[in-house]
């Protein structure tokens, strides 16, 4: 199985200029336990959080997220309104962290278009990735030189095409993951819209099955202690003059075991060093 | 363990304004937000509103509005509820919770009587 | 704003036997982005803050016996405890989770026959 990825995409309301949503998805076999979306940055890097979704406890939402709802059961979305003259959205970013079970957290985020044309409304249309196994690392510069050249050719084609725009879907969801999704741990490259800047980062699972209250629970997520990435790659795709990146730190020193969390009882861990277990709360 | 602990019973005149305290332990204060609910005597259940601690973010129930205000301070993981121009309707048990309900303050009795 | 509306508003019931407390919503509770219900059951005791039961309509919490549970889409839902216990004497919420504002039914007291 690959490894999981997190897809955001921000499109302006083609009806009110002043609208926005944003629409997140987790592509990976795990369930998820929580998803938290934020602007200005990721959450707790800067970011403000503006709506964090429990797919059954329900939905918290801020000001100006106007409705946070889950589209599918692995994607969400996140209307937001913009009483400012000015837009400020335009050039803001939006980023979205899925928790989830067994991965751990993983977080990307994304910004609007520079020249988004709201009247659009056309399918996505991923730009295939070459995939690069752990086994064939040696070959891995020629394989990025190869689809480097592959992705420049393909951009060309579409110089004039209208921008592509996710409208999130079961059969869309399908399409990324068959499509554009081909993540591997050394690298992964991810492409589904030119211009959403992806930066995943990732804190695995740790198992803690005995619970501190004695009670039979599903397993919990223990602290993260940064260790040195044990894994890192980040691979620009140049695509129409944006940037993609794919980061995967990854951290594997397990701390101290959380207490009760309560419903679900799933934590999240969070990349953030020596503070990192979040969990159903972010439990210090 | 994640507990919720609240100031104690408040005695106030009509017309004055109280505040209660939640102070929050156990878990990253800024991660969620604390929703404050309240029960008058023999009554059901009322949501105020909430706050999002770091952002101090807010969402307030429209019939409490301008009347009460949410603040936060994240050095001390401590959320208050202020509720201004007191009335006798106003005599009710307030609680402070979080994660959806999931964990609450053990709730304070504030009486308004003159 | 939702409203929600439990009846019966008090119910008596033997040790031993089943409990039933229904709990209807002026608008559908269930998302159909995830097929989720968006409804929670508190139980409150005389002198304790609520506690929460079962959300998601039907997902017990942790800790909760198991004799407790929920059932229900859309606008009906039910809680049951299937043989009632002694400690089991509270007054119960059903909760609107869906949107803004969180609503709460009116509580229904249950108490020992």
């Known amino acids: 199985a690959g490894t999981p990825e997190v897809w955001v995409q921000v499109q302006m309301e083609a009806t009110e200029l002043s609208s926005f949503t944003v629409h997140c998805g987790f592509l990976g076999p795990g369930s998820i336990s929580l998803v938290t979306v934020s602007w200005g940055g990721p959450d707790g890097a800067g970011g403000t959080k503006l709506a964090v979704l429990h797919p059954e406890l329900g939905t918290r939402q801020w000001a100006p997220a106007r409705q946070a709802r889950w589209e599918t059961q692995s994607s969400i979305s996140l209307a937001l309104e913009d009483s400012g003259a000015s837009s400020p959205f335009a050039n803001t970013t939006f980023c979205c962290k899925f928790a989830s079970f067994p991965e751990g957290s993983w977080e990307s985020c994304g910004s609007l278009p520079p020249s988004s044309d709201p009247g659009l409304s056309a399918p996505p249309t991923p730009v295939p990735i070459l995939r690069a196994d752990l086994a064939g690392i040696l070959g891995l510069s020629g394989v990025l030189l190869f689809g480097c050249g592959y992705l420049l050719h393909l951009l060309r084609r579409q110089k004039h095409r209208p921008t592509p725009r996710l409208q999130p879907s079961h059969t869309n969801s399908q399409a990324l993951t068959a499509q554009a999704w081909a993540p591997s741990q050394a690298s992964q490259a991810a492409l589904h819209d030119p211009y959403a800047t992806i930066n995943t980062s990732f804190c695995p699972a740790t198992l803690d099955t005995a619970h501190p209250n004695g009670w039979a629970s599903l397993p919990t997520h223990a602290a993260h202690q940064p260790q040195g990435p044990a894994a890192s790659a980040s691979t620009p795709i140049l695509a129409r003059g944006s940037f993609v990146s794919v980061e995967n730190g990854l951290y594997t020193q397990a701390g101290e075991r959380p207490p009760h969390t309560g419903p679900g009882l799933t934590l999240f861990p969070d990349c953030r060093g020596p503070r990192a277990l979040e969990g159903r709360f972010g439990v210090r | 363990e994640v507990q919720l602990v609240q100031s104690g019973a408040e005695v106030k005149k009509p017309g004055s304004s109280v505040k209660v305290s939640c102070k929050a332990s156990g878990y990253t204060f800024s991660s969620f937000s604390i929703e404050w609910v309240r029960q008058a005597p023999g009554q059901g259940l009322e949501w105020m509103g909430e706050i999002l601690p770091g952002s101090n973010s807010t969402n307030y129930n429209e019939k409490f509005k301008g009347r009460v205000t949410f603040t936060a301070d994240e050095s001390t993981s401590t959320a208050y509820m202020e509720l201004s121009s007191l009335r006798s309707e106003d005599t009710a048990v307030y609680y402070c919770?979080?994660?959806?309900?999931?964990?609450w303050g053990q709730g304070t009795l504030v009486t308004v009587s003159s | 704003d939702i409203v929600m509306t439990q009846s019966p508003d008090s119910l008596a019931v033997s040790l031993g036997e089943r409990a039933t407390i229904n709990c209807k919503s002026s608008q559908s509770l269930l998302n159909s982005g995830n097929q989720k219900n968006y409804l929670a059951w508190y139980q409150q005791k005389p002198g304790q803050p609520p506690k929460l039961l079962i959300y998601g309509a039907s997902t017990r919490e942790s800790g909760v016996p198991d004799r407790f549970s929920g059932s229900g889409s859309g606008t009906d839902f039910t809680l049951t405890i299937s043989s009632l216990q002694a400690e089991d004497v509270a007054v119960y919420y059903c909760?609107?989770?869906?949107?803004?504002?969180?609503?709460f039914g009116q509580g229904t007291k249950l108490e020992i026959k």
């Open positions: 909760q609107n989770a869906h949107s803004y504002p969180p609503t």
């Open positions: 919770s979080s994660y959806w309900f999931a964990y």
